[in-house]
């Protein structure tokens, strides 16, 4: 029975040209994590395999860095990076857990204003 849950950073925004860390965390299970895939829509960005280490898709090599931990760092962000990202945890014996993160990449000034909102 799959008892685990994936916690993610949820919906996040970042500035164009900046970088962002995508993070997921698997909790409430003793299952062994054997592999974590990071996907953007239907594109495989990177895999971290417990035995084989990290492999970054060559198409994203210059803008994607492994880590920290099982997370993924996206660099030199463009507006085209806006969208859904998925962390897919392969575990033994539970099977597969999937987490979703929505990233919005904003023009610099918009991101700055968004960061200054106040609750009245």
């Amino acid at each position: 029975m799959m008892t685990g849950t994936i916690e993610t950073t949820g919906n996040i925004s970042a500035e164009k040209g900046g970088s962002i860390i995508l993070q997921c965390h698997l909790s409430s299970t003793t299952a062994q994590v054997t592999q974590v895939n990071w996907e953007q829509q239907d594109q495989l960005l990177a895999i971290c395999n417990a035995d084989l280490g990290w492999h970054i898709s060559p198409s994203f090599k210059d803008r994607v860095a492994p880590g920290p931990g099982l997370g993924l760092t996206l660099q030199s962000l463009t507006v085209n990076d806006t969208g859904e990202y998925f962390c897919i945890y392969h575990t033994y014996p539970d099977g597969t857990y999937t987490g979703r993160i929505f990233l919005e990449v904003l023009e610099s000034s918009v991101a700055e204003h968004g960061a200054r909102f106040q609750i009245p």
Partner: antibody, heavy 117, light 107 residues
Framework: DVQLQESGPGMVKPSQSLSLTCTAT?????????WHWIRHFPGKKLEWMGF???????VYNPSLKGRISITHDTSKNRFFLKLNSVTPEDTATYFC??????????WGTGTTVTVSS | DIQMTQSPASLSASVGETVTITCRTS??????LAWYQQKQGNSPQLLVH???TLAEGVPSRFSGSGSGTQFSLKISNLQPEDFGSYYC?????????FGAGTKLELK
């Protein structure tokens, strides 16, 4: 088009070291992908040996640990296999290959190595 | 190590027929299975990865299926160039391992 070509001696004596070179053309070995060695024994069996990343870090088949070393020379766009303390059981056709997420999308033509005194 | 059990070891078929080769793994590899074709005296060529994704330039008469521990490669409407040996390989952990191969011969 990416091409890989293995080279090295066709005959090695038992207890000596086997050294092979894989030269890549049409793609830089520092531009992503992993770079693997695989061998094909006379009886049909294929065995993955290990790989080197573009960064230079390596992963080896545990069955060969202690005997195998994979290195690269990025200035000449080539990578190397060294297998120590060979026996006749290491007689095989040796292939280098390009790895994408640990499957092999480009293979060299292969070079046959015989271990015999 | 993940053991790969490929069957049959050999197979005879005629041009135009459909054949299926199977690969069973000793543990769950999810969808991380590749298939290669090797012709006599040549290097293996990637046909399929991630169970069912055809490699570039591979004809649509090849199709892969399965998940977990049971996988298959189907070749429909066999062509003369399809005869040779076929190998499965998991791409999920260390060591990466191959099946023992299936030799497809012309009947």
């Amino acid at each position: 088009d990416v091409q890989l070509q293995e080279s090295g001696p066709g005959m090695v004596k038992p207890s000596q070291s086997l050294s092979l070179t894989c030269t890549a053309t049409g793609y830089s070995i520092t531009s992503g992908y992993d770079w693997h060695w695989i061998r094909h024994f006379p009886g049909k069996k294929l065995e993955w040996m290990g790989f080197i990343r573009d960064s230079g870090s390596t992963v080896y088949n545990p069955s060969l640990k202690g005997r195998i070393s994979i290195t690269h020379d990025t200035s000449k766009n080539r990578f190397f296999l060294k297998l120590n303390s060979v026996t006749p059981e290491d007689t095989a056709t040796y292939f280098c290959a390009r790895g994408l997420f640990w499957y092999f999308d480009v293979w060299g033509t292969g070079t046959t190595v015989t271990v015999s005194s | 190590d993940i053991q790969m059990t490929q069957s049959p070891a050999s197979l005879s078929a005629s041009v135009g027929e459909t054949v299926t080769i199977t690969c069973r793994t000793s543990e769950n590899i999810f969808s991380y299975l590749a298939w290669y074709q090797q012709k006599q005296g040549n290097s293996p060529q990637l046909l399929v990865h991630n169970t069912k994704t055809l490699a570039e330039g591979v004809p649509s008469r090849f199709s892969g299926s399965g998940s977990g521990t049971q996988f298959s490669l189907k070749i429909s409407n066999l062509q003369p160039e399809d005869f040779g040996s076929y190998y499965c390989q998991h791409h999920y952990g260390n060591p990466l391992t191959f099946g023992a191969g299936t030799k497809l011969e012309l009947k």
